[in-house]
């Protein structure tokens, strides 16, 4: 019987010879659970596992803890891969995180973190980041040190308010912090002075809601 080949991430897919962008099935080692992820095989050498994408407002990102845990949306379009999968993956080896951003004026920028991982669900999928470079700000728009993940039904932020309800979307909110890539999607010419938009403060400033975002990870030794 032919052995089934499985891939833990898009870097393994790439190294196996599949070098075309698209949706691939990923499976963690010692697991039977599969997830569908979009693989970017072109940008910066390829092998990137897309863990979040916003592009047109077609998917509702005001979701529950469980939905953010297991993932939602369409891997070919807007989606969230899932905190549990990303947590397990990023605790097995060292990963880098690249966040690619687009504004409504045709500009693009990125933030690259040389080390990224999420804590377990017991620790509320707290984000850990180190070593920022890139063009989307010299200061991290994800608050440092990293915060716990919060959703509309799980308030783990540092605010007297409930950030996820106030800003919408699940995120590593502080109180509430300089970013929220899972906020409300606003169309062009309606994207400024927004209290709950798609925010990356140290690139576009306050109240500016972005046109597009992609969060992608890849092993540091790729």
């Amino acid at each position: 019987k032919e052995e089934q080949i499985s891939f833990r991430d898009c870097a393994e897919v790439f190294k196996s010879g599949h070098t075309t962008n698209g949706v691939y099935t990923l499976t963690l080692p010692n697991s039977t659970e599969e997830v569908k992820a979009y693989c970017d095989m072109e940008a910066g050498g390829g092998g990137w596992t897309i863990i979040q994408r916003r592009e047109d407002g077609s998917v509702d990102f005001q979701r529950t803890w469980k939905e953010y845990k297991v993932g939602f949306g369409n891997p070919s379009g807007e989606y969230w891969l899932g905190n549990e999968f990303v947590s397990q993956l990023t605790n097995q080896q060292r990963y880098v995180l690249k966040i690619h951003l687009k504004d409504w004026e045709g500009n693009e920028a990125y933030s690259l973190y040389e080390h990224f991982y999420l804590s377990s669900e017991e620790l509320n999928y707290r984000i850990h980041l180190k070593g920022l470079t890139g063009t989307a700000g010299k200061i991290s728009s994800i608050s440092q040190p990293g915060n716990d993940f919060s959703t509309k039904d799980a308030d783990n932020d540092k605010c007297i308010c409930k950030c996820s309800q106030m800003l919408t979307g699940g995120w590593w909110f502080d109180a509430c912090g300089p970013s929220n890539l899972n906020g409300m999607y606003y169309p062009q010419r309606q994207n400024t002075n927004k209290f709950n938009g798609i925010k990356w403060y140290y690139w576009k400033g306050s109240g500016y809601s972005l046109k597009g975002t992609t969060m992608m990870i890849r092993p540091a030794d790729f």
């Epitope: 540092k158 605010c159 007297i160 308010c161 950030c163 106030m166 502080d174 109180a175 509430c176 912090g177 300089p178 002075n193 927004k194 209290f195 938009g197 925010k199 403060y201 306050s206 109240g207």
Partner: nanobody, 129 residues
Amino acid sequence: EVQLVESGGGLVQPGGSLRLSCAASGFTLDDYAIGWFRQAPGKEREGVSAIRDNGGSTYYADSVKGRFTISSDNSKNTVYLQMNSLRPEDTAVYYCAAVPAGRLRFGEQWYPLYEYDAWGQGTLVTVSS
């Protein structure tokens, strides 16, 4: 649509006074804090004063304490900054900005700059003889 419109800037001699207004629309002041900020040429934007809770809580930067007074008229959805004893170093573009009042860190009284998501276009204040 959220809008903030500043007015009242102008040229004034050292020691003089001005009153700036910030008219808000698209939301009510009851649930928001309003901050005044200023930016001089070649310098970072800095916080000057802020108000929330219908005037129950106010903040002033050390550089303007005793000279500037912030107030609000919720019936007009407008916040004012009365500036007395003006100095040349007060010359700057003055902006007002809004943040949901509840967006406060536990134990803190005021808000980092990045929490203010709605901004006006600014009004120029020039203090010169």
